[in-house]
């Protein structure tokens, strides 16, 4: 069913990191025009997105609100300049998206070392606990906030003269890790999310090396 | 179901090298780095090192560098542990496992190794 | 490198007794410690993971204390089927580093 000249939208893509969610769609639109719902499996329908001619919505704001839940979307065709045309079935053309579950499958976004400071043999190593969309009591949680101890870090680290990795892990947002006095190391860290089977992994975060801007060193 | 499969045992002459092999199938194979395990007749378990499959990175134990090189094929879903410059201190269990990253929760049922000339 | 010592490296039980085997981490590892049991010509299989959580399908029996440097495994009620080899492994610094074991025979 559907209206004249309208075609249904197709491979409806949910593209999320950080909890940073839009739903993604084809094809590009020629004479219609695209409004997007979402709701929760027992919730009510929400619009959003209005008779834009885009290709993708921006649904954050909902799913922010419980990344919990499950989400399903979609997404309905108009004809351009007569949204209020319907099908033979007298309701619009629409498709729906698979479902969505922020928690478990929002991509972890590539993590940043905030600082590394040297103490003798030991190096601290601080990774940026990064601020989400997601709010409660009106402030904005990390990643941490929201993940707490299903989210670990790993980090990788080298000699600057070797090429033989090490690693280390941390359930929190700092390692201790001992190092060869006088040697300089480089560090990357990656974030992980062990309980999951899918979009465990973060891509790596940029290298940082010892005798940069980024780091502290102390001779005890 | 998730299983790793590794071949059977290996007799080869000191010297050689050998490739062993790990099938990794029930899972999103990049989405879990593959270890590499030695344990020696009667011995405790060595860790070799592990294989990151989804851009091939690896980490290897000090003691194995230069002796072990671990490698994948994305396409087949396999893990690879290649042994070179055999020698007897060599023979052993191989086993190949799953990194959860708290623990190792899948095994491979061990390809045994013998180097005798 | 993390050293794992393992004790003790046998022990002999009866039926349905309890035993205890320790790991001291040579630094401290938080909690990042599993515990696996082998069974002869078989590989290793989880048994604990993060130092006392239960691997799933473990019978309750098996359990796990400990963090920083000190870790204690329990079997209480002894089974015929638990008299094989147990090891302590540290997931928390590459190399990834196992005690050296403990077998656990029929008195």
């Known amino acids: 069913s559907g209206t004249t000249n309208t075609v249904a939208a197709y491979n409806l893509t949910w593209k999320s990191t950080n909890f940073k969610t839009i739903l993604e769609w084809e094809p590009k639109p020629v004479n219609q025009v695209y409004t997007v719902q979402i709701s929760t499996k027992s919730g009510d329908w929400k619009s959003k997105c209005f008779y834009t001619t885009d290709t993708e919505c921006d649904l954050t704001d909902e799913i922010v609100k419980d990344v919990k839940q499950t989400y399903l979307a979609r997404v309905f065709s108009y004809p351009a300049g007569n949204v209020e045309s319907t099908g033979s079935a007298g309701e619009p053309l629409y498709e729906n998206s698979p479902e969505f579950t922020p928690y478990l499958e929002t991509n972890l976004g590539q993590p940043t070392i905030q600082s590394f400071e040297q103490v003798g043999t030991k190096v601290n190593v601080t990774v940026e606990d990064e601020r989400t969309l997601v709010r409660r009591n009106n402030t904005f949680l990390s990643l941490r906030d929201v993940f707490g101890k299903d989210l670990i870090y790993t980090l990788y680290y080298w000699k600057s003269s070797s090429s033989g990795k090490k690693t280390a892990k941390t359930n929190t947002n700092e390692f201790l890790i001992d190092v060869d006095k006088g040697e300089n190391y480089c560090f990357s860290v990656q974030a992980v999310i062990p309980s999951r089977t899918v979009n465990r992994k973060s891509t790596d975060s940029p290298v940082e090396c010892m005798g940069q801007e980024k780091g502290e060193f102390r001779e005890i | 179901e998730v299983l790793l499969q590794q071949s059977g045992p290996e007799l080869v002459k000191p010297g050689a090298s050998v490739k062993i092999p790990c099938k990794a199938s029930?899972?999103?194979?990049?989405?879990?780095?593959m270890d590499w395990v030695k344990q020696s007749h009667g011995k405790s378990l060595e860790w070799i090192g592990d294989i990151n499959p989804n851009n091939g990175n690896t980490i290897y134990n000090q003691k194995f560098k230069g002796k072990a090189t671990l490698t994948v094929d994305k396409s087949s879903t396999t893990a690879y542990l290649e042994l070179r410059s055999l020698t007897s201190e060599d023979t052993a269990v191989y086993f190949c496992?799953?990194?959860?990253?708290?623990?190792?929760?899948?095994w491979g049922q061990g390809t045994t190794l013998t180097v005798s000339s | 490198d993390i050293q794992m010592t393992q004790t003790p490296a046998s022990q002999s039980a009866s039926l349905g007794e309890s035993v205890t085997i320790t790991c001291l981490a040579s630094q401290t590892i938080d909690t990042w410690l599993a515990w696996y049991q082998q069974k002869p010509g078989k590989s290793p299989q989880l048994l604990i993971y993060a130092a006392t959580s239960l691997a799933d399908g473990v019978p309750s029996r098996f359990s796990g204390s400990g963090s920083g440097t000190k870790f204690s495994f329990k079997i209480s009620s002894l089974q015929a089927e638990d008299f094989v080899s147990y090891y302590c492994q540290q997931p928390y610094s590459s190399p990834y580093t196992f005690g050296g074991g403990t077998k656990l025979e029929l008195k």
């Open positions: 496992a799953r990194d959860h990253d708290y623990y190792f929760d899948f």
């Open positions: 029930g899972y999103t194979f990049t989405e879990y780095n």
